[in-house]
């Protein structure tokens, strides 16, 4: 591979590490790129034991601008020294580096969820992966926000054990024939900025429902 003098410094790449469906996903964007790379290779090492940079297997010569590092980055405390190389054909266009600490840099994307409206309650079904690595739990708590007619109520369901498998929460004591919107997100113990899901809304049916919210529980 030929190595032209890179026309991008570290400042030319913006990195983001996110917990998406409890997987560690590193994504990147390029600034001021005159030539768009045809592919990327991601390498890293751990600062505490600086060995040669290791190529991330599933992110070698990739055309995607993200990389799943769940199986590579297992510690929230370690500093991961990361290098992204961008190529056009056999020519290296640039090399960007950045250091990550998952405990500091990780942002938490909201889980997938569905809602089903009944006369006086809403079932919120939150989808978690079947298995979540212990180190990716991050002291997170699930928050379900219910909105109606400008009033926002926060629900913090208690989840026994790890956030894994599907989880159903019932928002009850609701008013029939009323529009309700629901958002879910993961909140960190230090109340750092959260990423809320888009709202999902439902108009509850009118009239009496024989089955009460209590028996639905």
């Amino acid at each position: 591979i030929s190595y032209d003098s890179p026309d991008y410094t570290d400042e030319s790449c913006t990195f983001k590490i996110s917990l998406r469906n409890f997987r560690s996903i590193l994504s990147w964007e390029l600034k001021n790129h005159s030539i768009v790379p045809t592919h990327y290779t991601l390498l890293y090492t751990i600062m505490s034991k600086p060995e040669d940079l290791k190529v991330v297997k599933n992110c070698a010569n990739t055309t995607r601008s993200f990389c799943d590092l769940t199986d590579e980055w297992r510690s929230t405390h370690e500093a991961y020294v990361t290098v992204l190389e961008g190529f056009s054909g056999n020519t290296t266009l640039f090399s960007c580096s950045h250091n990550f600490w998952l405990a500091i840099d990780m942002s938490f994307e909201p889980p997938e969820f569905e809602i089903v409206g009944f006369t006086n309650h809403i079932n919120v079904m939150v989808k978690f992966p079947s298995i979540v690595e212990e180190e990716l739990q991050f002291d997170l708590s699930l928050v379900i926000e219910e909105q109606s007619e400008g009033i926002v109520k926060k629900h913090k369901p208690e989840i026994k054990g790890n956030m894994s498998g599907n989880f159903t929460y019932i928002i009850d004591k609701l008013i029939p024939n009323t529009n309700y919107c629901v958002s879910v997100y993961l909140e960190h113990s230090d109340e750092q900025a959260v990423i809320k899901s888009p709202l999902k809304c439902t108009l509850l049916p009118p009239g009496q429902e024989s089955e009460s919210a209590e028996s639905a529980k």
Partner: antibody, heavy 119, light 112 residues
Framework: QVQLQQSGAELVRPGTSVKVSCKAS????????IEWVKQRPGQGPEWIGV????????RYNGKFKGKATLTADKSSSTAYMQLSSLTSDDSAVYFC????????????WGQGTSVTVSS | DVVMTQTPLTLSVTIGQPASISCKSS???????????LNWLLQRPGQSPKRLIY???KLDSGVPDRFTGSGSGTDFTLKISRVEAEDLGVYYC?????????FGGGTKLELK
């Protein structure tokens, strides 16, 4: 060699704010975390928060959220901590420290900045 | 928050004699990555704090080998085999395993 040079002592009025600086030298500023710690006389230190100067990402101790604001200026290799709505409880020595290798490992410390809140 | 309890509060020693400081945490400091993020620092009067030990037992460069750190789980110890005058000051343990990081109340090492 690694050095963290903090700004000088401050005497400030209650209700005002103060900005403490921490200038790093002897290493690549954006490659390491900067932590901030509060120490009142005769007490153990309290952790305020941490910033990654490379990304600008921050984590605060919930106790100091809304009280402390951490920032970093890459061009001058300087980290800042602003303390707002000061009361006598904020009178303390504030330290910045560098993290190498691990979050929370704080291998080099600044000399401390004394903040006295008094009317 | 994890509570770090140091004993004794004050330790009066003779130069050349050994010293031992205990640090106990309210919950285990063993992280899911297999490491224990327990550190020790020394604060001499009028000086910046100086880290001595990290990851329970790893000595920082320039720290004399008369210092040793040991322990696991919730119980940790800092030992000085033969105290020298430059060792006097306040010693703090702190943990970085759990959020937020927390410090012990300190142990003052002074001359008898």
């Amino acid at each position: 060699q690694v050095q963290l040079q903090q700004s000088g002592a401050e005497l400030v009025r209650p209700g005002t704010s103060v900005k403490v600086s921490c200038k790093a030298s002897g290493y690549a500023f954006t490659n390491y975390l900067i932590e901030w710690v509060k120490q009142r006389p005769g007490q153990g230190p309290e952790w305020i928060g941490v910033i990654n100067p490379g990304s600008g990402n921050i984590r605060y101790n919930g106790k100091f959220k809304g009280k402390a604001t951490l920032t970093a200026d890459k061009s001058s290799s300087t980290a800042y901590m602003q303390l707002s709505s000061l009361t006598s409880d904020d009178s303390a020595v504030y330290f910045c420290a560098r993290d190498a290798y691990y979050v929370g490992a704080m291998d080099y410390w600044g000399q401390g900045t004394s903040v006295t809140v008094s009317s | 928050d994890v509570v770090m309890t140091q004993t004794p509060l004050t330790l009066s020693v003779t130069i050349g004699q050994p010293a031992s400081i205990s640090c106990k945490s309210s919950q285990s400091l063993l992280d899911s990555d297999g490491k224990t993020y327990l550190n020790w620092l020394l604060q001499r009067p009028g000086q910046s704090p100086k880290r001595l030990i990290y990851l329970v037992s790893k000595l920082d460069s320039g720290v004399p080998d008369r210092f040793t750190g040991s322990g696991s789980g919730t119980d940790f110890t800092l030992k000085i085999s033969r105290v020298e005058a430059e060792d006097l000051g306040v010693y703090y343990c702190w943990q970085g395993t759990h959020f937020p990081q927390t410090f012990g109340g300190g142990t003052k090492l002074e001359l008898k």
